[in-house]
Amino acid sequence: GWVWNQFFVPEEMNTTSHHIGQLRSDLDNGNNSFQYKLLGAGAGSTFIIDERTGDIYAIQKLDREERSLYILRAQVIDIATGRAVEPESEFVIKVSDINDNEPKFLDEPYEAIVPEMSPEGTLVIQVTASDADDPSSGNNARLLYSLLQGQPYFSVEPTTGVIRISSKMDRELQDEYWVIIQAKDMIGQPGALSGTTSVLIKLSDVNDNKPIFKESLYRLTVSESAPTGTSIGTIMAYDNDIGENAEMDYSIEEDDSQTFDIITNHETQEGIVILKKKVDFEHQNHYGIRAKVKNHHVPEQLMKYHTEASTTFIKIQVEDVDEP
């Protein structure tokens, strides 16, 4: 019968011929009376056999990632009779892996959006690298992820590539971050190959800013001839949030005379001071009112940023009009 062991050849061998193993018949007594032949894909071009001894050699550099095994056929013939000594047999040459491929991030570019002020541990995104080396061959394709840029705001789980928040971030201070992740094979041991990817992480807005008046004092004037409903001036608060988080409502906090009202222009986010009752210069020539401003909608968990509404004082001077 045929005698052989499992055949392995390391990929990327640079030698002109590399001895893989021996194929022989147990009837072969070593007197060179048998001839061994190799058939099949790769026979003669990639692999050769010593016709006398049955020794098999690889004569080409192999790439496991291109082809990981070769199925060949062997024949042994009695030179004297020209007849087969053994039935033709199929055997396999496996190409064994070396760590010649670096991890690659195939889904880049990565981009993620996460709400500002998210707590530590919040999941941002998972990045995944793939390694063309053999996952069943040692640690050649076993990856470890690490953070090259992004501390102290982000962390990456070494085995999964899951990026999490490790420190609260405030959109109004910085609205986007570039995180650089490295994947290393060989679980980071010597001889490891690595690949990197960038992740753009954008912070979405939450309502963590209250509107605050630009000025602590406004001076307005109103003519005593002005009819009720007259707009006598505008006041303005700032809110550094965006979109609906910056929508605000103005209102009167103090007006003992109940002469004025404030309405909100939701297009411009300004407060418009309105005359609610007619004024009379001879009766009262100036007024002082206090206005306040609040966000339209604040979720309960963000109320700690909105403890006290901003107010402003408005001094209103009444202008005299000659009366008949």
């Epitope: 800013n209 605050i212 630009k214 550094n240 940023y305």
Partner: antibody, heavy 125, light 105 residues
Framework: QVQLVESGGGVVQPGRSLRLSCAAS????????IHWVRQAPGKGLEWVAV????????YYADSVKGRFTISRDNSKNTLYLQMNSLRAEDSAVYYC??????????????????WGQGTTVTVSS | YELTQPPSVSVSPGQTASITCSGD??????VSWYQQKPGQSPILVIY???KWPSGIPERFSGSNSGNTATLTISGTQAMDEADYYC?????????FGGGTKLTVL
């Protein structure tokens, strides 16, 4: 790393002028407003002036209004404080400090997150 | 606009220190706090009443209500001995408190 470095301090006579500089590195200078803050020997911090990231707005403390001018050159990553008509009470360590907050935010709610090491100005005859 | 701080506060190691800052309707504004050690530049420790800048331990906390803002340092350490300044914003100008010297006994 993120850094502000002041220079230009020294001893000057009352009524004379001095120009302080503040060189920025490690961040995008043109995205940040910058303040000048001073501290007289043994005293507390006193705000002097601020300039917006694009130079479009400048505000001053009443004590220096009309005498000091804040300016910036974003192409050189440098902030300046031109101090004229100097008085003895202007003697102090002058710090430049970055206004925290992205462009588009207003007010000074987020504090001053990066400070220089300071440069000393002494006004004395 | 004026902000008033006590000139000095003393605390034993491991105890809680509270430094106040008062101003008219201060609770309506946002307050920042700075730490300054001798010969050094100030460091921002709290902004917007109660938020931490990166790298500041959560032993430092802030609150602001009515006319008073408070900086609280829990589990005070010897390294916390410094001058502390509050800062607010009013009508386009910046205002600092007079500063409080924190002594860790």
């Amino acid at each position: 790393q993120v850094q502000l470095v002041e220079s230009g301090g020294g001893v000057v006579q009352p009524g004379r002028s001095l120009r302080l500089s503040c060189a920025a590195s490690g961040f995008t200078f043109s995205r940040y407003g910058i303040h000048w803050v001073r501290q007289a020997p043994g005293k507390g911090l006193e705000w002097v002036a601020v300039i917006w990231y694009d130079g479009s707005n400048k505000y001053y403390a009443d004590s220096v209004k009309g005498r000091f001018t804040i300016s910036r050159d974003n192409s050189k990553n440098t902030l300046y404080l031109q101090m004229n008509s100097l008085r003895a009470e202007d003697s102090a360590v002058y710090y430049c400090a970055r206004r925290a907050g992205i462009p588009g935010t207003t007010g000074y709610y987020y504090g001053m997150d990066v400070w220089g090491q300071g440069t000393t100005v002494t006004v004395s005859s | 606009y004026e902000l008033t701080q006590p000139p000095s506060v003393s605390v034993s190691p491991g105890q809680t220190a509270s430094i106040t800052c008062s101003g008219d309707r201060l609770g309506e504004k946002y307050v920042s706090w700075y730490q300054q050690k001798p010969g050094q530049s100030p460091i921002l420790v709290i902004y917007q009443d109660n938020k931490w800048p990166s790298g500041i331990p959560e032993r430092f906390s802030g609150s602001n209500s009515g006319n008073t803002a408070t900086l609280t340092i829990s589990g005070t350490q010897a390294m916390d001995e410094a001058d502390y300044y509050c800062q607010a914003w009013d009508s386009s100008t910046v205002v600092f408190g007079g500063g409080t010297k924190l002594t860790v006994l």
